[in-house]
Interface confidence: low
């Protein structure tokens, strides 16, 4: 459990892959902190408790309630708010101390699930990574998020300040492109319930300590039960789901959200002056201006909201979680003031929820979303966000109920459909998930054009034998989610040579291949000895990648880390491999034995990243009946020979022999990655 430098932790993506051939690896889900352009950083996930987390989808637009809310309704909102506010100081958000004097930050071990402070969200952004890694993941632009508010505020300025001397310009603040916390989508395919994940958790790089999810551990468990993980980007709740749509935008504009109460209208000039500073990027000055307004007018909701926004901007500018926690608290304060206009209340709480998610305070965010839904029960978009909030903490059952409720009221809500389909697929209700995923994507609603949904729709269709799967993969490719129809990994570095099968010479790793082929019997014998004496070390594939059969693996290295316990079972093999850093240092891969028994079929699936190539050394290969297809070419293994393929391309495996098949899997860095990229890419 060494404490982990968040930096290290961030950016570790979980894997969702397991290649059909004997491996089914899934590195625990890691929350990823994704940078927009190169989502390379991801937050850490705790181990023990961890539950793969994926992220929220896009968030909803801020739809303001009717502008003139009657006083009565206002009072109701106020009283409900007050009840809730005080009842709830949300859990984890202000973990002031979490970073502070709590002793050693708990690193959550994959296993331990201790709480730990995974909050270094800003600081961990690994700015040095220069390569472009596009993780086709959930990318929601965070930018929308604050700017959702922005839109509304601007309207405010337009509408309530017609004579404002300057035209209100869309905020040009830098948004956390990088801050979208893109969490990985863990697809444990059909295993999501508080089940025991049968997986191989090879603890790895970034999970927090013992029992807590997300906080500071360095270990990440490779959970073998997670099938494709697509990285999800944490979408800021407020990230305007519907506002991408011009029509919606217009509608929202028409609504002219009301951000000023009667009192605030009387101090409008002062508010505008402070807001102007913020909009011009003079953040420190704006903070001071709003602080002064809050001091002078402690009951002013708009002044308090302005202060929160300035703190939010400042957090982004300084990349400071501590400042962001202050903003989260201030957004909360807005909601606890008397006579808060409904639109402002909604904006403030939505942004609060979003920033809580960004910091990894999923439970706190959920409480905020629950509160929003109570306050604005007719706002479907908030219910959709609430569903995402539940998904983010692993509560599929409640998420499912939320989406069922949304669909009962608005049956054509595309966002609810894709998420409901997603949940059904997670429950292994493959056929039932298809119409929801399909119609949801077809709806074109904001938040539905996400690689994960194409990924799962295609996968579901393949599993029920529907040839239309490739139509959806093609569409996903056209829309920029996949590198090609065949190559559907989500964590990719652009520009790397892409071909399904490789020769040793093409990889440049000829010495490694020679060494594997020269020593294949030694490698085989150690694997067989483990099978014989410690069969329990071979852990079953549990990513729901198999249509049928029996398939297990025994992992020696994962995420660039040697598993000392495992190497005790195969000491010579481990010693042999130590000479080859292209594999032992491949933090986006594994080294493992893979045993597959007769009668096994592994569904077509795709690995998580194009940053590795996968070598298969045949150890015990039945005469016939075993084959692997990668893209559109099918091959068979031979004892003592290495096959090399790029598992970011779709691959499928069949074992129809009469005895077991044992191979040794060795992942290597893609040969075109530079040394700097190899050092800086987050682990998978």
């Amino acid at each position: 459990f060494d404490l982990v430098d968040y930096e290290e932790v961030l950016g570790k993506l979980g894997i969702y892959d397991a290649d059909g051939d004997g491996d089914f690896d899934v590195d625990d889900a890691k929350v990823l902190l994704g940078l927009k352009e190169r989502s390379t950083s991801e937050p850490a996930v705790p181990p023990e408790e961890a539950e793969p987390h994926t992220e929220p989808e896009e968030q909803v637009p801020v739809e303001a309630e009717p502008q003139n809310i009657e006083d009565e309704a206002k009072e109701q909102i106020q009283s409900l708010l007050h009840e809730m506010v005080h009842a709830e100081h949300v859990e984890g958000e202000d973990l002031q101390q979490e970073d502070g004097p709590t002793g050693e930050p708990q690193q959550e071990d994959d296993e331990f699930l201790m709480a730990t402070d995974v909050d270094d969200r800003f600081e961990t952004l690994e700015p040095e990574v220069s390569h472009e890694e596009t993780e086709h993941s959930y990318h929601v632009e965070e930018t929308v998020s604050q700017d959702c508010n922005q839109d509304m505020e601007e309207m405010m300025s337009e509408q309530e300040n017609p004579d404002s001397s300057e035209p209100v310009v869309e905020d040009e603040r830098l948004h956390h492109d990088t801050d979208d916390v893109t969490y990985q989508v863990y697809e444990e395919q059909a295993v999501y319930e508080p089940l025991e994940n049968e997986g191989i958790e090879i603890t790895e790089v970034t999970a927090p300590p013992e029992d807590n999810p997300v906080e500071d551990s360095q270990v990440i468990v490779e959970e073998v039960s997670i099938f494709p993980v697509e990285e999800q980007q944490e979408v800021p709740p407020e990230t305007n789901r519907k506002t991408d749509d011009p029509e919606q935008k217009a509608k929202v504009k028409k609504k002219k959200p009301k951000l000023l109460n009667k009192f605030d209208k009387t101090i409008k000039a002062e508010l505008d002056a402070a807001e102007k500073l913020r909009k011009r990027g003079k953040i420190e000055e704006a903070v001071n201006a709003f602080k002064e307004l809050v001091r002078k007018y402690p009951q002013s909701p708009r002044a308090r909201y302005g202060k929160a926004q300035c703190e939010d901007d400042l957090a982004e500018k300084r990349r400071s979680n501590e400042v962001l926690r202050g903003a989260i608290e201030t957004y909360q304060e807005v909601a606890s003031l008397p006579d808060v206009p409904a639109d402002l209340l909604k904006l403030s709480l939505k942004r609060r929820s979003d920033r809580q998610q960004f910091l990894g305070h999923m439970r706190g965010s959920l409480l905020t979303l629950q509160r929003l839904v109570q306050l604005f029960p007719n706002d479907t978009s908030l219910k959709n966000d609430l569903g995402v909030g539940y998904l983010l903490i692993g509560d599929n059952d409640n998420a499912k109920k939320v989406y069922e409720e949304v669909l009962s009221v608005t049956p054509n809500d595309g966002f609810a459909k894709v998420h409901y389909g997603f949940i059904l697929k997670a429950q292994n209700k493959i056929a039932e998930s298809i119409p929801y995923l399909k119609e949801g994507i077809e709806s074109g609603d904001p938040g539905t054009d996400d690689g994960r949904f194409y990924f799962h729709l295609g996968d579901a269709m393949q599993r029920v034998g529907n040839k239309e799967a490739y139509k959806w993969y093609e569409l996903g490719h056209k829309r920029g989610h996949f590198a090609s129809v065949w190559q559907r990994s989500l964590y990719n570095v652009n520009g790397l040579k892409a071909q399904p099968w490789w020769t040793p010479k093409e990889t440049g790793y000829t010495e490694l291949v020679k060494s594997l082929e020269r020593n294949w019997k030694l490698i085989r014998d150690e694997g067989l000895a483990v099978m014989d004496k410690a069969k329990g070390l071979f852990l079953p594939e549990d990513e729901n990648l198999r249509e049928k059969g029996d398939w297990s693996q025994f992992t020696l290295w994962q995420q660039g880390r040697r598993n000392e316990n495992a190497c005790k079972g195969a000491p010579k093999t481990c010693t042999l491999l130590e000479k080859f850093p292209e594999t032992t240092g491949c933090r986006r891969g594994q080294i493992k034995y893979s045993i597959m028994h007769p009668g096994t079929h592994v569904w077509p699936h795709t690995g998580p990243t194009n940053c590795r190539l996968r070598m298969h050394l045949g150890l015990v290969i039945p005469k016939e009946g075993c084959k692997i297809r990668c893209a559109n070419e099918t091959k068979t293994w031979e004892e003592g020979k290495v096959l090399i393929f790029d598992d970011s391309f779709e691959h499928e495996v069949w074992q129809d022999a009469s005895s077991f098949r044992l191979i040794f899997i060795v992942d290597v860095w893609h040969p075109e990655l530079t040394p700097q990229q190899r050092r800086s890419l987050p682990a998978i």
Epitope: F1, D28, A29, V31, V45, P46, P47, E48, E49, E51, P52, H53, T54, G92, L95, Q97, E98, G100, G103, E104, P105, Q106, D109, D110, E111, F112, L113, M114, A115, Y186, E187, E188, Y192, E193, P194, L195, E196, N197, G199, E201, T203, A207, E210, D211, N212, P213, E223, I226, E230, R363, L391, L392, G394, F422, A426, G536, D542, N563, E564, N565
Partner: antibody, heavy 127, light 107 residues
Framework: QVQLVESEGGVVQPGRPLRLSCAAS????????MHWVRQAPGKGLEWVAV????????RYAGSVKGRFTISRDNSKNTLYLQMNSLRPEDTGVYYC????????????????????WGQGTTVTVSS | GIVLTQSPATLSLPPRERATLSCGTS??????LAWYQQKPGRAPRVLTY???NRAAGTPARFSGSGSGTDFTPAISSLEPEDFAVYYC?????????FGPGTKVDIK
């Protein structure tokens, strides 16, 4: 069904060692971190140690650090607590407990508390 | 390490009453706090984790709230089977620790 069964404890003299084991069944043992928790007669619960799902990491309470070792054998679905240099204050009922966890792609690994406990085994340290 | 305190040590209430327990921590543990119930001669069982999340099998009458350093779980209406000892436990920092317990007995 999901079950944890501790081995018989026993009476042991101060300074002597004792090894407890906990046999797991009904779930995928290798996917869960495991704890030992103890309870002195008439007292409250005291956390003792935890080991990660794969046995590679462990943590201990200050009162037992350096004397107790937690380990596991996933091939046998068994958790162990090796107790050396036992003291009278180590007397009590020892429970093994599983860390509950779940996963779904939308969420990180999540924690569900120590959700399954053994029935407990009594250790008495006395001369 | 973090020290947990629970009050009262004993709470005597009749069935059907509402029971409110309290757990304080010497440092901020955020929401990383669980509650366990233990009956005489039995192993503990988890009731709630991460403050307010009911574990599988925990009746809806049990609820949890609080964050940071002060936590107050409640049982809305005591049933005969609820008379037991209740422990809070933090997992925010090592070493993990339990509180001393609150005994809820029948008045």
């Amino acid at each position: 069904q999901v079950q944890l069964v501790e081995s018989e404890g026993g009476v042991v003299q101060p300074g002597r060692p004792l090894r407890l084991s906990c046999a797991a069944s009904g779930f995928t043992f290798s996917s869960h971190a495991m704890h030992w928790v103890r309870q002195a007669p008439g007292k409250g619960l005291e956390w003792v140690a935890v080991v990660s799902h794969d046995g590679s990491r462990d943590r201990y309470a200050g009162s037992v650090k350096g004397r107790f070792t937690i380990s596991r054998d996933n091939s046998k679905n068994t958790l162990y607590l090796q107790m050396n240099s036992l003291r009278p204050e180590d007397t009590g009922v020892y429970y093994c407990a599983r860390v509950g966890r779940s996963s779904n792609w939308f969420s990180r690994y999540y924690y569900y508390g120590m959700d399954v406990w053994g029935q407990g085994t009594t250790v008495t340290v006395s001369s | 390490g973090i020290v947990l305190t629970q009050s009262p040590a004993t709470l005597s209430l009749p069935p059907r009453e509402r029971a409110t327990l309290s757990c304080g921590t010497s440092q901020n543990v955020s929401h990383y706090l669980a509650w366990y119930q233990q009956k005489p001669g039995r192993a503990p069982r988890v009731l709630t984790y991460d403050v307010a999340n009911r574990a599988a099998g925990t009746p809806a009458r049990f609820s949890g709230s609080g964050s940071g350093t002060d936590f107050t779980p409640a049982i809305s209406s005591l049933e005969p089977e609820d008379f037991a000892v209740y422990y809070c436990q933090q997992r925010s920092n090592w070493p993990q620790a339990f509180g001393p317990g609150t005994k809820v007995d029948i008045k």
